[in-house]
């Protein structure tokens, strides 16, 4: 049987001779050279050679455990003469023994990390990791210990975990933002003779809101013309903040001062400036100088830094209003006047008033824009602005007159203003009602008394304040006749009724009925309209057959009698 089990071989042999591994030996070997040892398997004949007579095994090359820690080979012992095995083939291993020939290597050449400024001591920053290729199961060749070579007193590293933490209180990004830390990893548990590797950790302090905004000056002064429309920017102010990003964002507001009604401040999000703008129309003549208190504040405040003081600052803004020569200003944006349509010429309707708003208070003259009053219906007193009629009015022709009045500075005619003037013509009951249409109606010769032959309607050009009320009657001169009557229906209609049985068209072919129509308003208006009634021949159903005068045998008569 074989006299071995496994062999151990130290890696990285540096001797000039082959490295002796061990000896294969069978108890069948009598030492007479009759046995022959044969080696096969991992590296046999190349890496490992055997003396076929003695069974001595040697390694021909330097071995590296980290490359291959175990070799599996097979051994044979055969009769040299017959070639027959004297032992069954057997497997054995060569185990490569570790030496500390590998330094720890970090997973990254350079680490980058961030940590908030002003972080508490011991705040986690980053964990670095180094690996050692040596055998961790044997000795301390792979036992790594971390230490800081550069970066103290700001940071520390946990020796066993490689966790880097802050080591100094109140690290201020605004003082220093970047740190380069060098970490060493050493094997052999950090003992003398151990191998080591290093890595660089670039640490950036991130910003926290630990700085308030600050105005670089306590007072600002701007000028703006009084003509600046609302929304006009008149100046920019900027508070500085040592922080960055949202911690440096600033909101501006007007907190006090006599001008906070007149001005606004808006924040320019890109430049973080406060833009002072006009909020309401300015008037040099009313106020020439405004003083505002403007505040700059951080909208994003960290409560834990509130003890550092208020995160806001204020400055005084002085705004000087410059005078602008302005046109006259009317007392109203538009004037609405009323006048009765029966007003006589030169009737005063009302007046307009304009004033030079400038300190000079230049006198003003008034005129009517004739493009808006081509017919010269109205006039204006150039001195006092009184509007009066220069022609007669008629509401039924035009209800509203829309004219424009101009006010011009006498000393500076270039400065003028216009104002619309809406003149409503009030209704006077000055139109009589009249028939809604021309009425020509027909009556059958055989008509019976009290037969309705026509319904009358009237219209009135006057303003139907709530609807006209009309009355109808036969004119007095016709009322005594007994041919037709009018029945006022009291609903603004009236009916013409026959007043007798039968009409003879040979005697009278046409009747002209004068009808008086009156409105029930004041002043009372009435008119007389004429209704023509033709006498016709009809069939027994009452259908007209012949009404024409030329069809009659006898000369026709024409009567105004009703």
């Amino acid at each position: 049987s074989w006299m071995w089990n496994q062999f151990f071989l130290l890696e990285e042999y540096t001797g000039s001779d082959y490295q002796y591994v061990g000896k294969l030996h069978s108890d069948q070997d009598r030492g007479d050279g009759s046995l022959k040892y044969i080696l096969s398997g991992d590296g046999a004949g190349d890496l490992f050679i055997i003396n076929e007579n003695t069974g001595d095994i040697q390694a021909t090359k330097r071995l590296d455990r980290e490359e291959k820690p175990v070799y599996i080979l097979r051994a044979q012992a055969v009769n040299r003469r017959t070639g027959r095995p004297v032992e069954p083939e057997s497997e054995f291993i060569i185990k490569i023994h570790d030496i500390n020939d590998n330094e720890p290597i970090f997973t990254k050449d350079v680490y980058t990390a961030t940590v908030p400024e002003m972080a508490d001591v011991g705040t986690f920053v980053v964990q670095v990791t180094a690996t050692d290729a040596d055998d961790p199961t044997y000795g301390n060749s792979a036992k790594v210990v971390y230490s800081i070579l550069q970066g103290q007193p700001y940071f520390s590293v946990e020796s066993e975990t490689g966790i880097i933490k802050t080591a100094l209180l109140n690290m201020d990004r605004e003082n220093r933002e970047q740190y380069q830390v060098v970490i060493q990893a050493k094997d052999m548990g950090g003992q003398m003779g151990g191998l080591s590797g290093t890595t660089t950790v670039n640490i950036t302090l991130t910003d926290v809101n630990d700085n308030p905004p600050r105005f670089p000056q306590s007072t600002y002064q701007f000028k703006t013309p009084e003509s600046s429309p609302p929304g006009t920017p008149i100046g920019r102010i900027k508070a500085s903040d040592a922080d960055v990003g949202e911690n440096a964002e600033i909101e501006y507001s007007i907190t006090d001062g006599e001008g906070h009604e007149m001005f606004d401040v808006i924040t320019d999000q890109e430049t973080q400036e406060g833009i002072i703008t006009v909020k309401k129309l300015l008037d040099f003549e009313k106020k020439k100088v405004y003083t505002l208190k403007v505040e700059a504040s951080n909208p994003h405040v960290e409560p834990r830094f509130l003890y550092l003081g208020p995160f806001k600052d204020s400055a005084t803004v002085r705004i000087v209003v410059d005078d602008v020569d302005e046109p006259p200003v009317f007392s109203k944006l538009a004037y609405i006047l009323q006048i009765r349509e029966d007003a006589r010429i030169n009737t005063t309707i009302g007046s307009v008033a304009a004033q030079d708003p400038d300190a000079a208070r230049n006198p003003v003259k008034y005129s009517v824009d004739r493009h808006t009053d081509m017919d010269r219906i109205f006039n204006i007193d150039s001195g006092n602005g009184s509007i009066f009629t220069s022609k007669l009015l008629d509401r039924e022709t035009l209800l509203w007159h829309n004219i424009t009045v101009i006010a011009t500075e006498i000393n500076n005619p270039k400065q003028s203003s216009r104002v619309p003037l809406y003149i409503k013509v009030l209704d006077v009951n000055d139109n009589a009602p009249e028939f809604a249409e021309f009425y020509e109606t027909f009556v059958c010769e055989k008509a019976k008394a009290d037969q309705l032959i026509q319904t009358l309607r009237a219209v009135d050009k006057d303003d139907p304040y709530s609807g006209h009320q009309f009355s109808f009657s036969l004119a007095p001169e016709a009322a005594s006749s007994s041919n037709f009557t009018i029945q006022d229906n009291k609903d603004n209609t009236a009916g013409i009724l026959t007043r007798k049985n039968g009409y003879n068209r040979h005697e009278m072919s046409t009747y002209l009925l004068p009808v008086v129509i009156s409105d029930n308003d004041y002043p009372v208006q009435s008119s007389t309209g004429t209704v023509t009634v033709r006498v016709c021949a009809c069939d027994h159903h009452g259908n007209m057959q012949s009404c024409h005068a030329e069809a009659l045998i006898h000369p026709t008569g024409l009567s105004t009698g009703a």
Epitope: D427, V428, Q469, P476, S518, D521, Y522, V524
Partner: antibody
Framework: QVQLLESGGGLVQPGGSLRLSCAAS????????MNWVRQAPGKGLEWVSV????????NYADSVKGRFTISRDNSKNTLYLQMNSLRAEDTAVYYC???????????WGQGTLVTVSS | DIVLTQPPSVSGAPGQRVTISCSGS????????VSWYQQLPGTAPKLLIY???NRPSGVPDRFSGSKSGTSASLAITGLQAEDEADYYC???????????FGGGTKLTVLG
Amino acid sequence: QVQLLESGGGLVQPGGSLRLSCAASGFTFSSFAMNWVRQAPGKGLEWVSVISSSGSNTNYADSVKGRFTISRDNSKNTLYLQMNSLRAEDTAVYYCARPSYFQAMDYWGQGTLVTVSS
Amino acid sequence: DIVLTQPPSVSGAPGQRVTISCSGSSSNIGSNFVSWYQQLPGTAPKLLIYDNSNRPSGVPDRFSGSKSGTSASLAITGLQAEDEADYYCSSYDSFDHSWVFGGGTKLTVLG
């Protein structure tokens, strides 16, 4: 049905003022002109004043011109007569009346007595 | 001041016919319609005749009106005791846009 109801009469000293009201119902008040007519004790009827349907036109008897003012509020269906600088000869029953068919006064109120006396 | 002229009083026995005249001018009766009012003692006037000769509903046909030129008249036939009242004629005046009344006529039913 049409109704006219006067109020506001009473005893007043010469030079004093009174305001009469006439509440109308049963018709479209704003479509009709309206009259005040008075009747002194034992005397005949005397027309006093008229106002157009919209209130824009008014007229007065010479005897009251400059002292009396007629007005109306169409939203309240009410006619008014403001009487200032009253005289003894203004003592009368005051009627409001609606002029209709060809200016005939078809409806009258029951009247309100105004007495001007010291 | 009274513009239309009426007789102060008229009388008649029951069943009789009486007429009351009313005269004016061209600016009132001459160019406008006449209306007549009846005023019973202690009551408001009541429209009796309009448009010269028309009767409002409810007025008996014993009452009739007429107009000629600048005059008008009211006729009452079949006189009854309840007709005893004051009667006034009236017209619109186109000259000064006012209403004018007669001085009133007291009708007495005899017996």
